[in-house]
């Protein structure tokens, strides 16, 4: 059972630029098979589609490999412009941040947007708040009706980039002093 499919073993349209790197080529359909290590790419122009053999895949495509069969496959990750593999984006569409091979309109918790590269980078990680300190004013814990109490937290992990600010690590609030009058 055979289909009459004529295969030009020598690219008979070799002068045609689309036949570069081809093992089989036709005037109408371009390349159907590429030389080893080249990627088959199905170029679409309106209703027409024709095969080309490329050293690397164009933007929006990645090199899909099977034994002796390389092809440019379309990036299908949402909001992705170029990718490294089927499920790993390397550059997102405008307005989206790249994070672990995916594209986000805002960075996940614990990550901060880096606008110059449109990436989500590790933000500043801080520990838990301490208990509120003693209510004091002018370093004294008595002699005033009102004072301030403070609590703090430590930076557990510095941000990936110095330009990324850390959240506040100390905060104070108004408090009522336990002793309005100092003893003695």
């Amino acid at each position: 059972q055979g289909n009459r499919w004529r295969r030009n073993k020598r690219a008979s349209y070799v002068s045609n630029p689309i036949c570069k790197g081809c093992l089989s080529c036709s005037k109408d359909n371009g390349c159907s098979r590429c030389q080893q290590k080249l990627f088959f790419f199905l170029r679409r122009e309106g209703m027409r589609q024709y095969g080309e053999c490329l050293h690397s895949c164009p933007s929006g495509y990645y090199g899909h490999r099977a034994p002796d069969m390389n092809r440019c496959a379309r990036c299908r990750i949402e909001n992705c412009d170029s990718c490294f593999s089927k499920d790993f984006c390397t550059k997102c569409k405008v307005g989206f941040y790249l994070h672990r091979g995916r594209c986000f309109d805002e960075c996940p918790d614990g990550f901060a947007p880096l606008d110059e590269t449109m990436e989500c980078v590790e933000g500043c990680e801080v520990g838990h708040w301490s208990e509120w300190g003693t209510c004091s004013r002018n370093n004294r814990t008595c002699g005033f009706k009102w004072g301030l109490e403070t609590r703090t937290r430590q930076i557990v992990k510095k941000p990936a980039k110095d330009t990324i600010p850390c959240p506040t690590i100390a905060e104070s609030r108004r408090c009522k002093m336990a002793m309005r009058h100092c003893p003695g």
């Epitope: 499919w5 080893q36 002796d68």
Partner: antibody, heavy 119, light 107 residues
Framework: EVQLQESGPSLVKPSQTLSLTCSVT????????WSWIRKFPGNKLEFMGY???????YYIPSLKSRVSITRDTSKNQYYLQLNSVTTEDTATYYC?????????????WGQGTLVTVSS | DIKMTQSPSSMYASLGERVTITCKAS??????LSWFQQKPGKSPKTLIY???RLIDGVPSRFSGSGSGQDYSLTINSLEYEDMGIYYC?????????FGAGTRLEIK
């Protein structure tokens, strides 16, 4: 005209190895991709794997542990070996060829050989 | 694996009728789709590849179309010799997978 012809035993016992040969004329197996496909009694078609022009192989994940495709370029033949067969492997086995993404896939087929797995 | 859902699974049609068989992929297959015809006791025969390219020698009443996940094979004016089982095949991703087939019979 490219022609493919399968040959091998039509009856194999469970747990044994199924071995088939595909003899190719009209084209060289050092060009293109040479596959095995099977058709189960309910008409379902399953691609099993291929051997390329350079001898590299691809096997479908579900069969990877018990399938092997090899070739003999001097005879222009390639082979299928399926180990530890069960009655579920009863099917018509076809060899078929294609020449790359831009050409027709499985443009040429053998006539198929029915292999029954039974004790 | 990419699942190819073919419909209908079987159909009866009259000579001269226009027939359409469809195949839906479980994901975008980027036009890497072929159609095959198989007659009783014969091996499958390729009709169409890359969605719409007709194989040399296949009658022009056969045509293919589609994109993304949805594809179809149309026989413009059914002839007696067109009866058989039709299969779609996706080869966008390994393992390549076939549809379950559509049995076409003449009314």
């Amino acid at each position: 005209e490219v022609q493919l012809q399968e040959s091998g035993p039509s009856l194999v016992k469970p747990s044994q190895t199924l071995s088939l040969t595909c003899s190719v004329t009209g084209d060289s197996i050092t060009s293109g991709y040479w596959s095995w496909i099977r058709k189960f009694p309910g008409n379902k078609l399953e691609f099993m794997g291929y051997i390329s022009f350079s001898g590299k192989t691809y096997y479908i994940p579900s069969l990877k542990s018990r399938v092997s495709i090899t070739r003999d370029t001097s005879k222009n033949q390639y082979y299928l070996q399926l180990n530890s067969v069960t009655t579920e492997d009863t099917a018509t086995y076809y060899c078929a060829t294609y020449h790359g993404y831009g050409g027709p896939w499985f443009a040429y087929w053998g006539q198929g050989t029915l292999v029954t797995v039974s004790s | 694996d990419i699942k190819m859902t073919q419909s209908p699974s079987s159909m009866y049609a009259s000579l001269g009728e226009r027939v359409t068989i469809t195949c839906k992929a479980s994901q975008d297959i980027d036009s890497y789709l072929s159609w095959f015809q198989q007659k009783p006791g014969k091996s499958p025969k390729t009709l169409i590849y890359l969605t719409n390219r007709l194989i040399d020698g296949v009658p022009s009443r056969f045509s293919g179309s589609g994109s993304g996940q949805d594809y179809s094979l149309t026989i413009n004016s059914l002839e007696y010799e067109d009866m058989g089982i039709y299969y779609c095949l996706q080869y966008d991703e390994f393992p390549v997978t076939f549809g379950a087939g559509t049995r076409l019979e003449i009314k």
